[in-house]
């Protein structure tokens, strides 16, 4: 499966959106940075077989997706960023599941590294656990937004390095 | 691949108020912080401030706050420095800098540095 | 303002040799997790190189015998061995807290 080159460029605008929901300042959030212990390994492309990439990439964009779906993320970001945000992820799940589907037929490894898929689910609960216990403060959702950026950009990392696979 | 390209060496008068920019080229300019570093000959490194070319948003190092303005224009991929009421501590050379990794706030691609001379 | 000192402000080793920088902040610049302590490399008439992020990261594309270390407040950067072309300035840079600070630099000479 190809992955399409709009959907690089849904990540980038997804990037983008990230960037723009600042609400205030990450300079006043300095002291309440954290290590999320971003599970870099997962990042590179070059450990994994395509399919295991491709789904390393989905569960990522579903977390990403999921975390900003609550209720608590509605009420500290500005509506209609918000909105383009969650449609760009959408779109790029989309894209994901299509090359799923194709590249199981194509390889007859396992569909998911389960590791894999799950150092990214115990990354997200970290990022969980961290606004639960800032009680979803505006700073707490600062250090969450850059940390989602890091993590964005790590996927657009991987997502070159599969597209240079092909 | 990453560029910072900074304008040209400046020779202003005390008093006076000089603009340097700085042109982004290889990666996505709204979605890196652009810090500004001023160096004066022989010394080590200060840091100015930094701004977010995607919202204009600044920060500023209090020493600088009244010294230097910052702005972006995000259709020419450039930063803008803007320094102010010109002293001879003002001669120096400064550098717009790439944000690295978000909110570690260091610094990977510099660019060659803009030369201000302050001079009666 | 946080202020690093770095010692020694130059230093002379023999090729080969170890070179080892210290950086020590007034205040800790180290919470959950991260050290916000990083390190450049300068050459005469260049710009600044980064070489090491969050107090131990080799930055991609630097060499393995560069390498950073501490937390806290102390930190340290070494260069096993030190080539010919590691004759540079080197500064430590924080960003625990505003305003980000340098250090006065340490100038390493090549015997």
């Known amino acids: 499966c190809d992955l399409p080159q709009t959907h690089s460029l849904g990540n980038r605008r997804a990037l983008i959106l990230l960037g723009q929901m600042g609400r205030i300042s990450p300079f006043s959030c300095l002291k309440d940075r954290h290590d999320f212990r971003i599970p870099q390994e997962e990042f590179d492309g070059n450990q994994f077989q395509k399919a295991q990439a491709i789904s390393v990439l989905h569960e990522m964009i579903q977390q990403t997706f999921n975390l900003f779906s609550t209720e608590d993320s509605s009420a500290a970001w500005e509506q209609s960023l918000l909105e383009k945000f969650s449609t760009e992820l959408y779109q790029q799940l989309n894209d994901l599941e299509a090359c799923v589907i194709q590249e199981v037929g194509v390889e007859e490894t396992p569909l998911m590294n389960e590791d894999s898929i799950l150092a990214v689910r115990k990354y997200f609960q970290r990022i969980t656990l961290y606004l639960i216990e800032r009680k979803y403060s505006p700073c707490a959702w600062e250090v969450v937004r850059a940390e989602i950026m890091r993590s964005l950009s790590f996927s657009t990392n991987l997502q070159k390095r599969l597209r240079r696979k092909d | 691949q990453v560029q910072l390209q900074e304008s040209g060496t400046v020779l202003a008068r005390p008093g006076a108020s000089v603009k340097m920019s700085c042109k982004a080229s290889?990666?996505?300019?709204?979605?890196?912080?652009m810090h500004w570093v001023k160096q004066r000959p022989g010394q080590g490194l200060e840091w100015i401030g930094v701004?977010?070319?995607?919202?204009?948003?600044?920060t500023y190092n209090q020493k600088f706050k009244d010294k230097a303005k910052l702005t972006a224009v995000t259709s020419a991929n450039t930063a803008y420095m803007e320094l102010s009421s010109l002293t001879n501590e003002d001669s120096a050379v400064y550098f717009c800098?790439?944000?690295?990794?978000?909110?570690?706030?260091?610094?990977?691609?510099w660019g060659q540095g803009t030369t201000v001379t302050v001079s009666s | 303002d946080i202020v690093l000192t770095q010692s020694p402000a130059s230093l002379a080793v023999s090729l080969g040799q170890r070179a080892t920088i210290s950086c020590r902040a007034s205040k800790s610049v180290s919470t959950s997790g991260h050290s916000y302590m990083h390190w450049y490399q300068q050459k005469p008439g260049q710009t600044p190189k980064l070489l090491i992020y969050?107090?131990?990261n080799l930055e991609s594309g630097v060499p393995a015998r560069f390498s950073g270390s501490g937390s806290g407040t102390d930190f340290t950067l070494n260069i096993h061995p030190v080539e010919e072309e590691d004759a540079a300035t080197y500064y430590c840079q924080h960003s625990g807290e505003l305003p980000f600070t340098f250090g006065s630099g340490t100038k390493l000479e090549i015997k």
């Open positions: 701004i977010y070319p995607g919202n204009g948003d600044t």
């Open positions: 969050l107090a131990s």
């Open positions: 800098t790439r944000n690295y990794k978000y909110d570690y706030y260091t610094m990977d691609y």
């Open positions: 290889g990666y996505s300019f709204t979605t890196y912080w």
